[in-house]
């Protein structure tokens, strides 16, 4: 024998208190699939989440973050704070980079700049908190005659600034 | 179900004080970080201040430190946030957030807020 509650189409329920009824879903309530004996309650995007996606019968509300936050973990589950540009996000809120390291990111950790001379390359342009170096040629590229541009000074050893 | 629900937002005056509460259901407040932050009218959301589980460490924006006081009763299932010396740029809408599960360690996303309560400061 067929189960009568295979017929109950996504957002409806298999109703057992009237012997088997499909029945639409409740408000605020929904279900995704065929055959279901219990509509799934819709998820509710407040406070730090916000609506993406109205939920309807057939399909759970999605959410995204309100603007100040981004979304992590899958179906935006969770929302974090974002951070300027040459900060890093701490449990203390959002803290500058340290002197050798950079951010050029709303979100993520601070890294260090990058090591030129394991290169064999001179540094260009020397890093901020939001941005890395840039590596230029090698100082042997740069002998007299080889170009008229005067490198500069090298960047200082990475330490930590007060915070 | 699980579920946040702030209370204690109201009109106050410049320089005056507010106490905002936070109810929680459905999880045991004792096992989560927990958080405050804040929406001014036609801005992004803040975050305000947060407090470990056992109320041994809080944290605070730089705006309100010295001002706001961030504390937990975890045998109510309450968050607190005393306001005081509050000025008009304290005017938003408050929430209260659950930090989830990893907080502090491997990221600082919150998983739970309520639905909020305004506080506006104005003469």
């Known amino acids: 024998l067929q189960d009568p509650c295979s017929n109950c189409p996504a957002g409806t329920f298999c109703d057992n208190n009237r012997n088997q009824i499909c029945s639409p879903c409740p408000p605020n309530s929904f279900s995704s699939a065929g055959g279901q004996r219990t509509c799934d309650i819709c998820r509710q995007c407040k406070g730090v989440f916000r609506t993406r996606k109205e939920c309807s019968s057939t399909s759970n509300a999605e959410c995204d973050c309100t603007p100040g936050f981004h979304c992590l973990g899958a179906g935006c589950s969770m929302c974090e704070q974002d951070c300027k540009q040459g900060q890093e996000l701490t449990k203390k809120g959002c803290k500058d980079c340290c002197f050798g390291t950079f951010n050029d990111q709303k979100r993520g950790i601070c890294r260090p700049w990058t090591n030129c001379s394991l290169d064999g390359k001179s540094v260009l342009v020397n890093g901020t908190k939001e941005r890395d170096v840039v590596c230029g040629p090698s100082p042997a590229d740069l002998s007299p005659g080889a170009s008229s541009v005067t490198p500069p000074a090298p960047a200082r050893e990475p330490g930590h600034s007060p915070q | 179900q699980v579920q946040l629900q702030e209370s204690g937002g109201g009109l106050v005056q410049p320089g005056g004080s507010l106490r905002l509460s936070c109810a929680a259901t459905?999880?045991?407040?004792?096992n989560y970080w927990m958080n405050w932050v804040r929406q001014a009218p036609g801005k992004g959301l803040e975050w305000?201040?947060?407090?470990?589980?056992?109320?041994?460490?809080?944290y605070y924006v730089d705006s309100v430190k010295g001002r706001f006081t961030i504390s937990r009763d975890n045998a109510k299932n309450s968050l607190y946030l005393q306001m005081s010396s509050l000025r008009a740029e304290d005017t938003a809408v408050y929430f209260c957030?659950?930090?989830?599960?990893?907080?502090?360690?491997?990221?600082?996303?919150?998983?739970?807020s309520g639905q909020g309560t305004t506080v506006t400061v104005s003469s």
């Open positions: 305000v201040a947060n407090i470990n589980q056992d109320g041994s460490e809080r």
């Open positions: 957030a659950r930090g989830g599960e990893g907080y502090g360690v491997d990221h600082y996303g919150l998983d739970v």
């Open positions: 459905g999880f045991t407040l004792s």
